[in-house]
């Protein structure tokens, strides 16, 4: 059956031979209605990429550099399956390119000019492409030929395989630049030896190189890693201090109609029957005909790449930046230490309008980018299409797991002028009911619930976390008879109460009328039994404070809070009747942009913050008529975090633990991708 066939692309006679053997052996173990292999032979990996894009083939395994080529238009391929190395219990699908230095030296990443450098080899990922790509815009002009620019940047180097005649400085630390193990400074171990011997000041290698060459921890402690934020970390902190994370070897397919499920079904079956130590007749990860045919010989198996993970996310911002710099050879005109405009991520067109107005008022210091969901915005910040946004704590957690950092906190209670330097304790997550109902925390089963959105703190993580510890399962849509929790599956009972309008029904953005704090409260007013919101929501939307038709006649005393002990209290008593304390919303950004974002926002709030009194004829950053666009409307200021500058420290141990527990109920495709 052609639609059940995976056309594998082979790039040599030897690969084609192995592919045919793969095809025949799979035929013998799979049912006739299962997936099958067909082989397509092409002259090169680039030809395979083009063939897949043109629907003449379906899959090929590529190294990271080629995954980048495959992702570029017009190819638009995406990673679908990753080879893993190491054990099944601790599968490694990536390695980290690092810059290693001796602990007793005192320079940072931005002080490499004039130092001596050790590289694994010319054109190699960890040893050349990544470090030189990231340093590209600091190299002296003209930057072509690249080897000459690098030779003029460092005071001496060992770059195995470089042309020692044309670029003698590149071979200064290893005469002749030998391109094999005859050169003592060749490849990973060689580059590390070059540093260890004192020939060089920095070695560009893989994170595992240090461990492979120094078994003794005391010896490893003599070395450190240079981080991109111009700090240093110990060699075992490579996950938080690397130049780039590099995928090892990846199967790619078309982004649309790419047969990814079929490819996974095929490879999963293949590893079961012909993986490491599985069969004598045919081995997926070795071949008598040559090395690394179709798959790497060192691979131990396959893992399915999460569906939310596109090539940009898979390759990572640093890797793409490095490769793009090298390939395109373009650098910003502004010096790199100058802050470029900050691209704010706006959710749907309501936030985009406010962002556009901000952009005009900021004289272009703020630019705007849009996405339809918070998770899409986070992904855009990760890959550099946007720079920053303000997030509820639940999304600060996801953003943190995806490598972003908190930059400033929204403060709601501290009056100026102390606001900017005050760390607030947070707000209360509460459960609101109508005073006329007889509901308590203990009899919510079968009732109608209203949530700000799935994954948000007050509307989801806190109440559902508490509920989970009571019911011990994740079927929240069965616990409540119906509800509105924007971001739920469209056919779920937790989308039944949502108001839409239609194509936007239950979408986690402002196009859904019951989205956010105000939306969840409106859902309670119009349809629901209980709303999970922040403690300020009822006072902010009653007593005529919200002029919208549905809210203008509401009275605060018509609503009460549910307490965890089964009692109820007035909405004026959240301190004595709440579900938990929630961390304030916070602005997040990529690490490399955090300082610029902070500086710019502090400047912007001085002009457009809560000191502006007349918002009808002036732009106000923290005002959107109860709709919490870009920031919560009750924000007094954006406050510095001081030492709370990681998502764990910002959110606090208790909240992180609660959200981590809820992860077994997670419906976050982005979180799944970021923890791959």
């Amino acid at each position: 059956v052609p639609e059940k066939s995976v056309r594998w692309c082979a790039v040599s006679e030897h690969e084609a031979t192995k592919c045919q053997s793969f095809r025949d052996h799979m035929k013998s173990v799979l049912p006739s209605n299962g997936p099958s292999v067909a082989c397509v032979k092409k002259a090169s990996h680039l030809d395979c990429i083009r063939a897949i894009a043109a629907n003449e083939a379906d899959a090929v395994t590529l190294d990271a550099g080629l995954v980048y080529d495959a992702y570029l238009a017009p190819n638009n391929l995406k990673p679908v399956v990753a080879e893993f190395y190491g054990s099944k219990e601790d599968p490694q699908t990536f390695y980290y390119a690092v810059a290693v230095v001796k602990k007793d030296s005192d320079f940072q990443m931005n002080q490499l000019r004039g130092r001596k450098s050790c590289h694994t080899g010319l054109g190699r990922s960890a040893g050349w492409n990544i470090p030189i790509g990231l340093l590209y815009c600091d190299l002296p002009e003209p930057r072509k030929p690249l080897e000459k620019a690098v030779a003029n940047f460092f005071s001496g180097s060992c770059v195995p395989c470089a042309d020692g005649t044309d670029f003698p400085q590149l071979c200064q630390l290893c005469p002749g630049c030998g391109c094999s193990t005859l050169n003592q400074y060749f490849s990973y171990s060689g580059a590390f030896k070059c540093l260890k011997d004192g020939a060089g000041d920095v070695a560009f290698v893989k994170h595992s190189t240090i461990f492979e060459n120094l078994a003794n921890k005391a010896d490893r402690d003599q070395y450190e890693l240079l981080c991109l934020d111009n700090t240093r970390k110990s060699v075992d902190e490579y996950k938080d201090c690397h130049l780039a994370r590099v995928p090892s070897h990846t199967v790619v397919a078309r982004s649309v109609g790419g047969k990814e499920d079929l490819i996974w079904e095929l490879l999963n079956q293949a590893q079961e029957h012909f993986g490491k130590d599985k069969s004598k007749e045919f081995q997926l990860f070795s071949s008598p005909h040559g090395k690394d045919l179709l798959f790497k010989d060192s691979a131990h198996g396959f893992l399915k790449v999460p569906p939310r993970m596109d090539a940009k996310m898979y390759l990572g911002y640093e890797y793409i930046t490095a490769i793009r710099n090298l390939r395109e050879g373009t650098c910003p005109e502004a010096p790199t230490d100058e802050c470029k405009p900050v691209k704010w991520c706006a959710l749907s067109h309501h936030e985009r309008l406010k962002c556009d107005e901000w952009s005009v008022n900021s004289a272009g210091k703020i630019e705007c980018e849009s996405a339809e969901t918070t998770e899409d915005c986070i992904a855009k910040i990760m890959n550099g299409e946007a720079d920053a946004m303000s997030l509820d704590g639940g999304f600060v957690y996801i953003a943190g797991m995806c490598g972003l950092v908190p930059v400033l906190a929204e403060n709601y209670n501290t009056p100026n002028p102390n606001c900017e330097n005050t760390a607030e304790e947070g707000y209360f997550a509460v459960a609101v009911v109508k005073s006329s109902s007889d509901l308590t925390w203990d009899n919510l089963k079968g009732k109608k619930s209203c949530h700000t959105a799935v994954g948000r703190t007050a509307g989801w993580n806190i109440p559902m976390g508490l509920l989970y510890s009571k019911i011990n399962h994740c079927r929240f849509d069965e616990f409540f008879s119906e509800g509105c929790a924007p971001g739920s599956e469209k056919n779920s009972s937790l989308c039944k109460l949502c108001m839409g309008p239609s194509p936007n029904l239950c979408e986690p953005n402002n196009k859904e009328g019951y989205y956010g704090y105000t939306g969840a409260f409106r859902c309670l007013v119009e349809k629901g039994d209980v709303a999970f919101v922040k403690h300020q929501t009822v006072p902010q939307n009653t007593g005529g404070k919200n002029p919208d038709a549905w809210a203008k006649n509401l009275k605060e005393e018509d609503y009460e809070l549910l307490c965890l002990d089964g009692s109820r209290k007035s909405v004026q008593e959240p301190a004595n009747c709440h579900l938990a304390r929630a961390p304030n919303h916070a602005v997040v950004a990529r690490k490399d942009k955090a300082d610029c974002v902070q500086t710019l926002l502090l400047d912007q709030q001085r002009m457009f913050g809560s000191s502006v009194t007349d918002c009808s004829s002036n732009f106000c950053l923290f005002e959107s008529k109860t709709k919490d666009l870009l920031f919560r409307d009750d924000t007094v200021c954006l406050a510095k975090l001081h030492d709370r500058n990681t998502y764990e420290k910002y959110l606090g141990e208790e909240y992180v633990k609660a959200v981590t527990n809820l992860r077994k109920c997670s419906t976050s495709p982005l979180l799944e991708a970021c923890t791959f």
């Epitope: 406010k354 004829s617 732009f619």
Partner: nanobody, 117 residues
Framework: EVQLVECGGGLVQPGGSLRLSCAAS????????MAWYRQAPGQQRELVAG???????KYADSVKGRFTISRDNAKNTLYLQMNSLKPEDTAVYYC???????????WGQGTQVTVSS
Amino acid sequence: EVQLVECGGGLVQPGGSLRLSCAASGSIASINTMAWYRQAPGQQRELVAGITRGGSTKYADSVKGRFTISRDNAKNTLYLQMNSLKPEDTAVYYCTDFSRDYYQDYWGQGTQVTVSS
């Protein structure tokens, strides 16, 4: 609430010029930010240019150096001078004063600009 009416669009050849006007039914002197947006078929509405009461301006990258936004508070009118027009400038152009609730999806009729040879 001030009503806004756009005019000045039309068919023009590539390289040509047009001047769009947006007349307000009341005073725009106290309105802080005004802007021109455009929407091509099947595309999202996008900001073209904006201007504040103090005269600070912002342009989309695609129109920088070709379009000029200005306002005349005495005449209660917002303008967009469009030079060196390109086929990709073809769209319906709208003006807004941002004074409405961001939530109200209110836009006028707009004015059609077609750049074609």
